[in-house]
Interface confidence: low
């Protein structure tokens, strides 16, 4: 070609036009070119429909062409990969028609101050989107709900100071987050869902520590080796975890997970109590992380959040109490549940050996608790036992976590899902609304017997007991290659919910309160 | 400005294997598509296979296809070309190459940083 070079790789056409001073499409491109580099040139405006002919197109550069405006017209329903990155774009366009395929779209370094309601729809391919280096404020709610398939979302060096709560909805497969560098001041409560979201990076933001802050606490204390600083230029091999540099922006630089909450209320305090998420509880079996959480009940709110699920996880899970206002997406309903007035659900339950059987109904007989555990091979997939894992006597770090092992940064931004590999079963769906159950009842659901050997609270002793406790069903899958240390936190505080459904505790749990 | 490293080059006879590494150091190399070429003497260098920053992405040169594997280790700032059922037209220099731009295939026009290359030798 004249103007462009033109090289075969592999079975694709690739079209270098990098830095030629183009003010336009060069015509008389091959017809069967794939990938087209159009960077570093002038051209101010584009239109995608010059680029219909190519038909096979899958990858296409603008990026550094001081484009103002992409009009988006007529359809390239193979390309996968668009580069508008470093150019003056002041509004979004809407590419969900023009572009079905679309799964990198890159828009970081323009000039976007807004992005409009389903400004990616259309977009069910997405798997990264980048926007870092924009002017965004704020987000419209459900701007993600088209790209249930997204991996990797960049917003960093925004402008923005809140985000939607529902934002991250239904990504089941987000694996890095980067919201550094903006004027975020909290996290709204449920935010993150049941996501386990391996690189998080959070820093630069005026975080403001009060008692709106609990739940984006909670979730850092129990994500500490998955929250990372960004360091552009740095070796990857020097990326550690640093969990203290999201820092209260009101406490002199004070970390947020370490934030203590003084005066904040707790359950019993007031009537307008809210919850914590639902976090992943894991315990390792040689190199692979078996992922399980349980859900335990004391229903007194309707939590809608629709969780999304990681791989094939079940949606319950331990949780424990938030104290703050209702969530947007919940409703206040009646309590079900009355609590003689002595029990303050205050408490930390360590099971230091705990068994989770799957049982048709709720037992009374005792179930000895094991005092030796023996590693399992790959569960079969509708086994529920957990082997017993020693668990440390302080649920929350005290100090600095210890960084974990060199793990990729992001890329470009990111793209560092390293080598995991793909899930093998689908995730179930997860429900949005539960339905509450008016009348305490278990006897219909699958329980599991918990032998919890040693039981210790902050402010009482009692007697341990192997009573078998009802709790919901646990699930569990294997997860290969996440090399974490093993902890089962089996922490119980307070005020708990499901998202599935609504079980009520066995009634025999009441001996396992401090009266 | 990236460096990179390639070892793992060496002779063997037509059939067997061979594992090549590109050590990359520098700034983060999970910033760049990695990829693979080679040039055989007296030829031009050829695409072999490249790799998306996830490493999810791959694409092969036709005549590598279900012989070679890529793949990449972001947390060891590495790149393998795993090599199987050699012949000896794989005889080449082998270069190892990064591109920070978006895109797994590339030509090398494209190519943001080279190795200066491993050589591989097939006997038959």
């Known amino acids: 070609h004249p103007i462009c070079e033109v090289s075969k790789v592999a079975s694709h056409l690739e079209v270098n036009c990098d830095k030629r001073n183009l003010t336009a499409l060069p015509p008389d491109l091959p017809k069967d070119t794939t990938i087209l580099h159009l960077s570093e040139n002038l051209l101010y405006t584009f239109s995608l429909a010059t680029l219909m002919p190519y038909t096979r197109l899958t990858q296409l550069n603008l990026d550094r062409c001081e484009l103002t405006k992409l009009q988006v017209d007529g359809t390239l329903p193979v390309l996968g990969t668009l580069d508008l990155s470093h150019n003056q774009l002041q509004s979004l366009p809407l590419l969900g028609q023009t572009l079905p395929a679309l799964t990198v779209l890159d828009v970081s370094f323009n000039r976007l101050t807004s992005l409009p309601l389903g400004a990616l729809r259309g977009l069910g391919e997405l798997q990264e989107l980048y926007l870092k280096g924009n002017e965004l404020k704020t987000l419209p709610p459900g701007l993600l709900t088209p790209t249930p398939k997204l991996e990797k979302l960049s917003l960093a060096n925004n402008n923005l100071t809140e985000l939607p709560a529902g934002l991250l909805n239904g990504l089941e497969n987000l694996d890095t987050l980067l919201l550094q560098e903006n004027s975020l001041y909290t996290i709204p409560k449920g935010f993150f869902g049941s996501h386990l979201l391996p690189f998080a990076f959070l820093h630069g933001n005026p975080w403001l520590c009060n008692c709106e802050i609990l739940y984006f606490r909670r979730w850092l204390q129990d994500n500490a080796e998955n929250v990372y600083v960004w360091k552009q230029g740095v070796d990857v091999k020097a990326m550690t975890s640093n969990v203290a540099s999201v820092q209260c922006d009101n406490s002199d630089k004070f970390p947020v997970y370490k934030y203590p909450g003084k005066g904040c209320p707790t359950l019993g305090d007031e009537g307008d109590t809210d919850l914590y998420d639902y976090y992943p509880e894991e315990d390792t079996e040689g190199d692979k992380v078996r992922a399980t959480r349980t859900v335990v009940k004391f229903p007194t709110k309707a939590h809608t959040t629709p969780w999304g699920l990681f791989y094939s996880w079940s949606t319950a899970s331990l949780d424990s109490q938030m104290p703050s206002s209702l969530h947007p997406t919940q409703e206040s309903t009646k309590e079900q549940t009355t609590f003689p007035p002595r029990w303050t659900p205050n408490f930390t339950l360590h099971m230091e050996s705990i068994t989770f059987s799957k049982t048709p109904k709720s037992t009374t007989e005792p179930t000895p608790s094991p005092t030796t555990s023996e590693p399992v091979p790959e569960p079969a997939p509708n086994m529920t036992t957990l082997e017993p894992t020693p668990s440390p006597t302080t649920p929350e770090p005290t100090s600095e976590p210890a960084p974990s092992p060199t793990t990729p940064e992001p890329t470009s931004e990111p793209a560092p899902s390293p080598t995991t590999p793909e899930p093998t079963s689908e995730p179930a769906p997860s429900p949005t609304t539960p339905e509450p159950t008016p009348i305490p009842t278990i006897a219909t659901s699958p329980t599991i017997l918990v032998s919890a050997t040693s039981l210790i609270t902050p402010k009482s002793t009692f007697l341990t007991t192997t009573k078998p406790v009802s709790l919901l069903e646990s699930t569990k899958k294997t997860i290969p290659e996440l090399d974490q240390p093993p902890k089962l936190r089996g922490v119980l505080q307070g005020h708990l919910e499901s998202s599935r459904n609504d079980p009520f505790l066995h009634p025999d749990f009441c001996c396992l309160l401090p009266l | 400005e990236v460096q990179l490293v390639e070892s793992g080059g060496g002779l063997v006879q037509a059939g067997g294997s061979l594992r090549l590494s590109c050590a990359a150091s520098?700034?983060?190399?999970?910033?760049?598509?990695m990829g693979w070429f080679r040039q055989a003497p007296g030829k031009e260098r050829d695409f072999v296979a490249g790799?998306?920053?996830?490493?999810?992405?791959?694409y092969y040169a036709d005549s590598v296809k279900g012989r070679f594997t890529i793949s990449r280790d972001n947390a060891l700032n590495t790149v393998y070309l795993q090599m199987n059922s050699l012949k000896p037209e794989d005889t080449a220099a082998y270069y190892c190459?990064?591109?920070?731009?978006?895109?797994?295939?590339?030509?090398?026009?494209?190519?943001?940083?080279w190795g200066k290359g491993t050589l591989v030798t097939v006997s038959s």
């Open positions: 520098g700034p983060t190399v999970s910033n760049y598509y």
């Open positions: 190459a990064a591109r920070e731009r978006v895109g797994i295939t590339f030509a090398h026009s494209t190519v943001d940083y």
């Open positions: 790799i998306s920053r996830s490493g999810v992405e791959k």
